[in-house]
Amino acid sequence: CDLPQTHSLGSRRTLMLLAQMRRISLFSCLKDRHDFGFPQEEFGNQFQKAETIPVLHEMIQQIFNLFSTKDSSAAWDETLLDKFYTELYQQLNDLEACVIQGVGVTETPLMKEDSILAVRKYFQRITLYLKEKKYSPCAWEVVRAEIMRSFSLSTNLQESLRSKE
């Protein structure tokens, strides 16, 4: 399945929107830095495209879920959030089309299921951190920075998959 060129542009727009969402000076937030343990190995180049797309889909779905909460709506600019949702929704659609195309071709590898679980656990850690920090502005900024980094890393994987073909 070939992801459309617009998918890459959408990924870049998503990162731009995340950058624009920033609301406070970040230097005072250093003490809230946290190791969320992004499962980078699950986005390694050893995977085939068919195995990677469901993992990328899970990643974007979890980002969507994280920023769709009541607490998130209170933390960020509504207009930017709406644009952000639109971009994520479009990327989910692109990836879902690929997942559907891949159904029935091969059995779902166990490796892929483990990777999806690792992504879910990563987002559980982020959610728990926000809860522990009482959804403070700094905690949200730390999470935004983390999502920018992890989303960027997963986007880079998409690009490397495309260039390999």
């Epitope: 970040l26 250093l30 003490k31 830095r33 946290h34 969320f36 730390v142 920018m148 960027s152």
Partner: antibody
């Protein structure tokens, strides 16, 4: 390959102005902060301040607040450190280094080669 | 501001020795964001350890970091000729970021 390349050595007179630069390459310049560190001859490292090139937000050490200005031009991936009126006590080696911001990643993992500033009448 | 105090200020050691440098913060670094750097004369500092105990990529495993709260340690398990340098700790917990005064490791 990640690189921070600083401008060359400067010899200035007291009261003169100066702007030194630090050009980043091999990474997304706006995804990292740039910090500036002073090292006076035979002395230790002193943190001067930091800039987020994505929006030019800055933070300074109280010791350097009002003494220097940190700026950045993200269009050319360059950070700057400037003085409006140099003093003999500004004679030092100045380093820039990249910082991961709020990410849990190595602090100051790449450094520029340093710019030696000599202020003498 | 968080003050960082290193000890000793200098030490003499031989190749193969185990070397320990300590760094004490004036207040607790609650997320343990304490970094260690090595600097050789005429060169820029080089990151060795970040977040108290994480070894920076490409740094030999003879270097290790430990500690939490206010007390941190850099250990060189078996000193090599290229390890003679000045070592600095730095807290990344809050601005202003601050460095220790340095520990010079010299040849005995």
């Amino acid at each position: 390959e990640v690189q921070l390349v600083q401008s060359g050595a400067e010899v200035k007179k007291p009261g003169e102005s100066l702007k030194i630069s630090c050009k980043g390459s091999g990474y997304s310049f706006t995804s990292y902060w740039i910090g500036w560190v002073r090292q006076m001859p035979g002395k230790g490292l002193e943190w001067m301040g930091i800039i987020d090139p994505s929006d030019s937000d800055t933070a300074y050490s109280p010791s350097f607040q009002g003494q220097v200005t940190i700026s950045a031009d993200k269009s050319i991936s360059t950070a700057y450190l400037q003085w409006s009126s140099l003093k003999a006590s500004d004679t030092a080696m100045y380093y820039c280094a990249r910082h991961p911001g709020l990410n849990w990643a190595p602090d100051f993992d790449y450094w520029g080669q340093g710019t030696l500033v000599t202020v003498s009448s | 501001d968080i003050q960082m105090t290193q000890s000793p200020s200098s030490l003499s050691a031989s190749v193969g020795d185990r070397v320990t440098i300590t760094c004490r913060a004036s207040q607790s670094i609650r997320n343990n964001y304490l970094n260690w750097y090595q600097q050789k004369p005429g060169k820029a500092p080089k990151l060795l350890i970040y977040a108290a105990s994480s070894l920076q990529s490409g740094v030999p495993s003879r270097f290790s970091g430990s500690g939490s709260g206010t007390d941190f340690t850099l250990t060189i398990s078996s000193l090599q000729p290229e390890d003679f340098a000045t070592y600095y700790c730095q807290q990344g917990y809050d601005t202003p970021l601050t460095f220790g005064q340095g520990t010079k490791v010299e040849i005995k």
